[in-house]
């Protein structure tokens, strides 16, 4: 058993059918020696007496919170949430697992530019009774400090019969140097309560292998004479790392016609221009990579051809 | 159609071209090693970061672009040098600073250089001849050492009388490989850099 | 006051189905597990499971899984335990019980419903 | 599964008298065992828990004691409404399992 905030404790369990019960002794805040009895949860029903509370914690209906009283007054709570083991695995019953880039990914991370400030989602179906509190630091044996934000309700989805539910937060590294080489990862914390379930998920990530830029900004096309070609161009976007000569930018540009399966043309250029032929009722597409660090490549900006 | 980017003319800053080869054959290199050693821990994920030149030179604060001096992050609380304008010790004055950036850029390349030679040696030992490193990387790298035109010492290859352990070296090499490529971007982005000043 | 009144006795042919009840009432019924016991005439008890009122967590002694199933009402506080073909060994008194929270035992009882199977 | 052997089966006593009833567990149950008084047409009623602990409304002549795998109930003055069948029942590992029974008679 172990502190996950003031009054709140996580019990970690062995879940099989013949694990024995964790043994739990719960202690009255008080300075109170006698007539104290305990609680749990809406039920008036006096489970125990005396200053301390010895339970056998081995389902959920033990978990909850136990309160400690004395003649009709509350002394002190204790809340019991159940964290379970299954086959020597912690339970991922709360996240869905992305599958992205790989098996096992509950929380995806993203970073516009090298600053230090990066973006972490995840996606659960659970709409009511729960609870997410996320921590970040850059190492984890000597920790420097990441500051997060409150976890938020990002995006709703409907899937299938199903609602999906994306939450996201937003970290900042307290003292980050665009210009630095990472040789610690960022590692990132997250502890999700559903009801009485504890569950926690990590993520450990490098900055550089989370970038991904926003599209560039504007996208424009001017004709040239005599021509199909027209000159595509477009800017760095405003959120990309400064100087643009030293966090350089790679670009795709891409003709897209109306139909999908239409053959695509592109071209790649390190210059924020490109001349291209610009087909009826096709679009131009460009999008951005960093030009050094091959992480993942921008959304797409795009213009029709009209 | 796949169009690959154009290379930069001949009379640009003479190292952009040559850190961009540097760039492309250590990727190539690391991907190959990453398939061909699939069952040793090698990828980004797996392996310590390790920087052989730590305390040694100090490339990122030497190199450091005139706009992020003001970012107190970046200075590491060391007396730190940055690069101004100038060219890969070209016709032009160099800076004193400059000069600073591109020997320290120079010592890593020697280091690098010394310790990939030492590690291929000890490859070439190995019965099962698993993997080598790619001579057109330790040409690229020369080549770099060349452009950047400085003269020290060279250091002496280290070698080793006792029976090397090919599985270490599998797993240094991949550390190796993994931090030469990091340091390879720094230095593409500082000549880059150069080359717009 | 704490109150499990459980369904009248039941007499069933051999292949019948039968769902017999359990009625809380004096207490939250959220809070507590509901479980069942069996005891076969002349015999003594045998514990068949327990579950969740709030959300159906059963757990089963394998001797059982299969041949009973447990279900809850929450909205009526009601526990059921049903049989889709009955035998003439489950022939019995059937106890349900309040599972004590932090402990395991039950604290309270039903007064236990007859269940005689018989051709 | 966890068996519960208790002993005597049958034991014969009379009111005022001392009553101690055994119970063995094949394996360590640590202090979760329960005592159960069940009397003739009624349902099971709890006495002891957590090895020791009386339950509320039981008088104190009930007690209970015990740890690991050797349990004891013990009626420490018999009165003529204490003669039923006792139960002892292990709430440590699933599934949870109650001992034959110890039938308390009058002598």
């Known amino acids: 058993i172990w502190e996950l905030k003031k009054d709140v404790y996580v019990v970690e369990l062995d879940w099989y059918p013949d694990a024995p019960g964790e043994m739990v002794v719960l202690t009255c805040d008080t300075p109170e020696e006698d007539g104290i009895t305990w609680t749990l949860d809406q039920s008036s029903e006096v489970l125990g007496s005396g200053k301390t509370l010895t339970i056998q914690v081995k389902e959920f209906g033990d978990a909850g919170q136990y309160t400690c009283h004395k003649g009709g007054e509350v002394l002190s709570h204790s809340l019991l949430l159940l964290h379970k083991k299954e086959d020597g695995i912690w339970s991922t019953d709360i996240l869905k697992d992305q599958k992205e880039p790989k098996n096992k990914t509950f929380l995806r991370c993203e970073a516009k530019n090298y600053s230090g400030r990066f973006t972490c989602w995840w996606l659960t179906t659970i709409s009511t009774d729960l609870t997410f509190s996320v921590k970040s630091s850059r190492g984890s044996s000597d920790p420097q400090g990441v500051t997060c934000g409150a976890a938020t309700l990002s995006a709703e989805r409907v899937r299938g019969d199903n609602k999906e539910y994306e939450y996201s937060v937003e970290c900042q590294e307290d003292s980050a140097c665009p210009a630095a080489e990472e040789s610690l990862p960022i590692e990132v914390m997250v502890d999700a309560v559903h009801k009485l379930k504890y569950e926690n998920y990590t993520s450990s990530f490098f900055i550089r292998d989370i970038i991904k830029p926003d599209p560039p900004k504007n996208l424009q096309l001017k004709p040239l004479k005599n021509s199909r070609q027209v000159e595509v161009s477009w800017e760095y976007p405003d959120t990309w790392s400064t100087p643009h000569s030293y966090f350089s930018l790679t670009f795709c540009v891409q003709v897209q016609g109306k139909s999908k399966r239409e053959k695509k043309d592109r071209v790649f250029t390190d210059k924020t221009s490109a001349t291209v032929i610009c087909r009826k009722n096709a679009s131009i597409s460009v999008r951005a990579q960093d030009r050094y660090y091959s992480s993942s490549w921008s959304e797409w900006a795009s213009v029709p051809c009209s | 159609r796949n169009l690959p980017v154009a290379t930069p003319d001949p009379g640009m800053f003479p190292c952009l071209h040559h850190s961009q080869n540097l760039l492309r054959a250590v990727s190539n290199m690391l991907q190959k090693a990453r398939q061909t050693l699939e069952f040793y821990p090698c990828t980004s994920e797996e392996i310590d970061h390790e920087d052989i030149t730590k305390d040694k030179t100090s490339t990122v604060e030497a190199c450091l672009p005139l706009e992020l001096t003001k970012n107190e992050s970046c200075l590491n609380s060391r007396e730190t040098s940055f690069i101004t304008n100038g060219s890969c010790l070209a016709s032009r004055k160099t800076s004193f600073m400059m000069a600073l950036c591109l020997s320290s850029i120079y010592e890593d390349l020697k280091m690098y250089q010394v310790e990939f030679k030492t590690m291929n040696a000890k490859l070439l030992m190995d019965p099962k001849r698993q993997i080598f490193l790619d001579q057109n990387m330790l040409a690229v790298i020369d080549e770099l050492m060349q452009a950047l035109n400085f003269n020290s010492e060279t250091v002496p290859q280290k070698s080793s009388l006792e029976e090397p352990d090919f599985y270490k070296t599998k797993i240094k090499l991949c550390i190796l490989l993994h931090a030469f490529r990091i340091r390879a971007v720094t230095i593409d982005r500082v000549m880059s850099y150069l080359n717009a000043s | 006051e704490v109150q499990l009144v459980q369904s009248g006795a039941e007499v069933k042919k051999p292949g019948e189905s039968l769902k017999i009840s359990c009625q809380s009432s004096?207490?939250?019924?959220?809070?507590?597990?509901i479980g069942w016991v069996r005891q076969m005439p002349g015999q003594g008890l045998e514990w068949i499971g327990i579950m969740s009122p709030v959300d159906s967590d059963i757990r089963y002694n394998p001797m059982f899984r299969g041949q009973v199933t447990m279900s809850v009402d929450k909205s009526s506080s009601t526990a059921y335990l049903q049989w889709s073909s009955l035998k003439a060994s489950d022939t019995a008194m059937y106890y349900c019980a309040r599972r004590r929270p932090g402990q395991g035992y039950f604290d309270f009882w039903g007064q236990g419903t007859m269940v005689t199977v018989s051709s | 599964e966890i068996v519960l052997t208790q002993s005597p089966a049958t034991l014969s006593a009379s009111p005022g008298e001392r009553a101690t009833i055994s119970c063995r567990a094949s394996q360590s149950v640590g202090s979760w065992l329960a005592w159960y008084q069940q009397k003739p047409g009624q349902a099971p009623r709890s006495l002891i828990y957590a090895a020791s602990n009386l339950q509320s409304g039981i008088p104190a002549r009930f007690s209970g004691s015990g740890s690991g795998t050797d349990f004891t109930l013990t009626i420490s003055s018999l009165e003529p409404e204490d003669f039923a069948v006792y139960y002892c029942q292990q709430y440590n590992i699933y599934p949870y399992t109650f001992g034959q029974g110890t039938r308390l008679e009058i002598k």
């Open positions: 004096g207490y939250s019924f959220t809070t507590y597990w």
